[in-house]
Interface confidence: medium
């Protein structure tokens, strides 16, 4: 079928558009153009007979017509008013015509856009500022951008006007931007130079500088006031009421006890028409006044709470001192004092904190000491300990259990048999026990300040027969070839022989094993990765005997020299390094890494996308074991060939 | 599994361009770099070069450079290889290949291969 | 552009066999890949890296060589181990492969 494709569709002024013929039919005598959608002798744009070549002007033509001989129609130097269709007439050789209708879109090349705005210098939080893209142009989109960023959404902005008009409903100091207007159509695109709105705003609340209120007679008062405002505020002073002077700084040398009294500074903007005040009290003294301390936290809970300690007065030019039980500051990450000295914070206070603590004045001649202040910490319960420590009674003898925890306040105690409440005292006393005596007894500590509670459950055995024993141990995790564990067989029994396998085994002969306490206790010396065994006790007189449940040695160890894989040390430009380390340790130790000595992450993985040459040199894998505080490490050298694609990767 | 689907046989007129496309399956393609290796008949393999569908990185072997043209197209897990200005040597199998970007530049997953045949 | 050359061009042996195959590189690489090619069809990673069995492949494949040698060693030649086998340098762009070797049943 015969059709006219149009390039381009959308044509600029000036430009130039081709009609182009698909599925032009064969034996042709000739075929004409019309202006329109249908052949119009009046409309007649050009006539051409293959015969003879011979192209022919018609009422339409404009001299900007090319007519080719595939039919094909070239229209140079654009203008507006040749929008619309176009239709081929084509005449084959046997006399039946055929037609086809093409169209194309005429677009003006934009002018650089302009903006006007009805309001150059609005009020923050009062004015809307209307911003209009000039000029209105048919056919053409408006675009907007604020910072070279298009528009943020925002209740306070609003278009209008077909995207032409931006307005910014109460305006803030954050209105304060470029702002540019783009013009758009099918053919061209121009952006405006930007506008910068001018925002008026406050003065805002001054501020006055420094904070000081505390001076000593002879001192220099230099005080500063700013506030936020555009334009810049005008600033004056007052003391007592009483006007001093218009400037953003008040200066008064060698004060007295007489210029103590309120200071005011009043800050004004004469485009807003705005005024605000902030003012401050100022107390000269003639001697300096016996210090105290203040607390912000008189009852601090222990690993909770942090409590400042602030030096009073406030004084100019003064040195502040403190003492700790009577002593100078001891050095302490949990210690910090302020730029000034005149505050002691410590960090997460504990039991130990309580104190006294002590402040000073440094004057001419003396310190002035302030009282002794004592920190009242609260803290606990600590886990209950419940003595005598045996597990294991025979029946008929009396039981006697005391508990006590670590606590302030001092703690609360109750007695729990079997989950059962029994009583709230320190001490439980049970006469010519039984063998329905056996069960678990929990002593429950209770600060009633802190609201904390916490418990210990003891488990009593009365039996003629010998209970399971269990193994304590005084180090549940030793450093490899630097400590020793002690393994004891509980409950002390007497008249009781003390067995002890490994991993099954009865015990190898080894000078890193030895047995005391009549057997009762067996120590390992100098432990190594190869001692983390199930470790077994066992108990048996004339009547019975019985096993522990296994207890496995967890052994501290390493790091081991690191290996980083993989093991190729030469990679190609563009390649992602992936370098792995490994160390065995326990428990798994930190990795860091280090590139020809500098450091990087600190990751098992290192990660590196694209290397180049630049990327060429030793590569550290370091491994440090927090628990067992050594550290190892290992270099890799790696090197990298030139890219083939000179200078660097393409994109 | 891994797989690579390629577009199938073009035949092109000398100067004329082919563009041939690789479907990838069974992995993320913006984890891998795309590799293209072609075989003239009868002929040994030559590497053509790689794009990082991530972000479009390329590198290509210098006798392509300024005739081969690798893109992606991430959402549909495809990777394309354009060669202009053809000539009747570059009758070939063209093969998409997944590689590691961590090097080391070894081919274990390959296209079936899309024969290219260039004659007037 | 590093120049791979594989030795010998083709070779005829029977099943059971032990092969070797050759590449020489024009100047020293780091590793070598080796791939197996049947006609119709698309090359097989063999052997990556010098000396690393590729997932799927059988063991009587074996790989070695460093600075500008290598070698690919088939232990004990199997009817389906008849193909064109080539090399690959991984150590410089652009990226090369040797020129092939046929093995052929004698």
């Known amino acids: 079928k015969l059709t006219i494709e149009s390039t381009p569709f959308n044509v600029a002024e000036g430009k130039e558009v081709l009609l182009l013929v698909h599925n032009l039919p064969q034996h042709l005598f000739g075929y004409s153009w019309y202006k329109g959608e249908r052949v119009d002798g009046n409309r007649q744009i050009i006539g051409y007979v293959i015969g003879t070549q011979q192209a022919t002007p018609g009422p339409a033509y404009s001299g900007r017509e090319i007519i080719y001989p595939n039919a094909s129609l070239l229209i140079q130097n654009i203008i507006q008013n040749d929008t619309g269709f176009y239709t081929l007439h084509v005449i084959k050789s046997d006399l039946v015509n055929e037609e086809a209708t093409g169209q194309f879109r005429v677009y003006p090349e934009l002018p650089k856009p302009s903006i006007s705005s009805n309001n150059s210098k609005p009020v923050e939080d009062k004015d809307a500022v209307a911003f209009t893209c000039e000029p209105e142009t048919q056919d053409a989109t408006y675009l907007w951008w604020v910072n070279n960023q298009s528009l943020p959404v925002s209740p306070r902005l609003q278009l209008s006007n077909g995207n032409r008009t931006l307005t910014l409903f109460n305006v803030t100091r954050n209105d304060t931007a470029s702002y540019k207007c783009e013009t758009q159509n099918p053919v061209s695109a121009r952006r405006s130079d930007s506008v910068i709105l001018n925002v008026l705003y406050g003065p805002d609340a001054p501020t006055i500088s420094p904070l000081n209120t505390s001076y000593r007679s002879g001192e220099n008062l230099n005080l500063s006031c700013h506030a936020a405002s555009n334009p810049p505020a005008q600033y004056s002073w007052f003391v007592n009421g009483t006007f001093q002077q218009s400037t953003q700084e008040l200066f008064i040398p060698n004060i007295t006890v007489n210029n103590s009294g309120s200071y005011t500074c009043q800050a004004h903007n004469s485009d807003t028409g705005l005024n605000r005040t902030t003012v401050t009290t100022i107390t000269v003294y003639a001697e300096p006044p016996k210090p105290f301390i203040t607390s912000n936290n008189s009852n601090p809970v222990e690993d909770e709470d942090a409590v400042a300690l602030t030096c009073e007065p406030e004084i100019q030019n003064t040195t502040y001192l403190w003492w700790v039980n009577n002593q100078s500051l001891p050095v302490s990450p949990r210690l910090q004092l302020s730029n000034d000295n005149r505050t002691l914070t410590l960090l997460s206070v504990t039991r130990n904190d309580v104190g006294p603590y002590e402040c000073g004045i440094q004057n001419k001649l003396s310190v002035d000491h302030s009282d002794p202040v004592i920190l009242n910490v609260l803290y606990g319960p600590d886990d209950p300990t419940i003595s005598p420590s045996y597990t294991y009674y025979r029946p008929g003898v009396n039981l006697s259990l005391s508990c006590h925890a670590a606590s302030n306040p001092p703690a609360q105690y109750s007695w729990l048999i079997d989950g059962n409440i029994q009583q709230h005292t320190q001490e439980l006393f049970i006469s010519n026990i039984t063998e329905k005596n056996s069960g678990l007894y929990t002593c429950q500590a209770n600060n009633s300040a802190s609201g904390h509670s916490r418990t210990t459950v003891k488990t009593i055995t009365v039996s003629a027969e010998l209970p399971k024993p269990s193994i304590s141990s005084n180090n549940s995790k030793p450093v490899e070839d630097k400590d020793a564990v002690a393994f004891t067989c509980e409950p002390e029994a007497q008249n009781t022989t003390y067995l002890w396998w490994v991993n099954g085994q009865s015990l190898p002969v080894s000078p890193r094993l030895q047995l005391s306490n009549g057997n009762r206790t067996l120590t390992l010396f100098n432990v190594t990765r190869n001692d983390a065994r199930a470790y077994v006790c066992g108990i048996q007189n004339s009547v019975s005997a019985n096993r522990s449940d296994p207890v496995t040695l967890d052994v501290l160890y390493g790091p081991d020299t690191p290996i980083i894989s993989p093991p190729d040390s030469s990679y190609l430009s563009g390649a992602n390094l992936n370098l792995s380390c490994h160390s065995a340790s326990n428990p798994s130790p930190q990795y860091s890494w280090r590139i020809n000595g500098i450091p990087q992450q600190h990751t098992q993985v290192l990660f590196i996308a694209k290397i180049t040459p630049n990327n060429n040199g030793t590569y550290a894998c370091f491994v440090s074991n927090l628990a067992t505080g050594r550290n190892n490490s290992i270099v890799k050298s790696i090197t990298v060939s030139a890219s083939g694609t000179s200078p660097g990767l393409s994109a | 599994q891994v797989q690579l689907v390629q577009s199938g046989a073009e035949v092109k007129k000398p100067g004329a361009s082919v563009k041939v496309s690789c479907k990838a399956s069974g992995f993320n393609i913006k984890d891998s770099y795309m590799h293209w290796v072609r075989q003239a008949p009868g002929q040994g393999l030559e590497w053509m070069g790689w794009?990082?569908?991530?972000?479009?990185?390329?590198e290509y072997a210098p006798k392509f450079q300024g005739r081969v043209t690798m893109t992606t197209d991430t959402s549909i897990s495809t990777a394309y290889m354009e060669l202009s200005r053809l000539r009747s040597d570059d009758t070939a199998v063209y093969y998409c290949n997944e590689g590691t970007p961590t090097g080391p530049y070894y081919f274990d997953y390959w296209g079936q291969g899309t024969l290219v045949t260039v004659s007037s | 552009e590093i120049q791979m050359t594989q030795s010998p061009s083709s070779l005829s042996a029977s099943v059971g066999d032990r092969v070797t195959i050759t590449c020489r590189a024009s100047s020293s690489v780091s590793y070598m890949h080796w791939y197996q090619q049947k006609p119709g069809k698309a090359p097989k990673l063999l052997i990556y890296s010098t000396s690393n069995l590729a997932s799927g492949v059988p063991s009587r494949f074996s790989g070695s060589g460093s600075g500008t040698d290598f070698t690919l060693t088939i232990s004990s030649l199997q009817p389906e181990d008849f193909a064109t086998y080539y090399c690959?340098?991984?150590?410089?762009?652009?990226?090369?492969f040797g020129g092939g070797t046929k093995l052929e049943i004698k």
């Open positions: 690959q340098q991984r150590s410089s762009y652009p990226l090369t």
């Open positions: 794009i990082d569908p991530e972000n479009g990185d390329t």
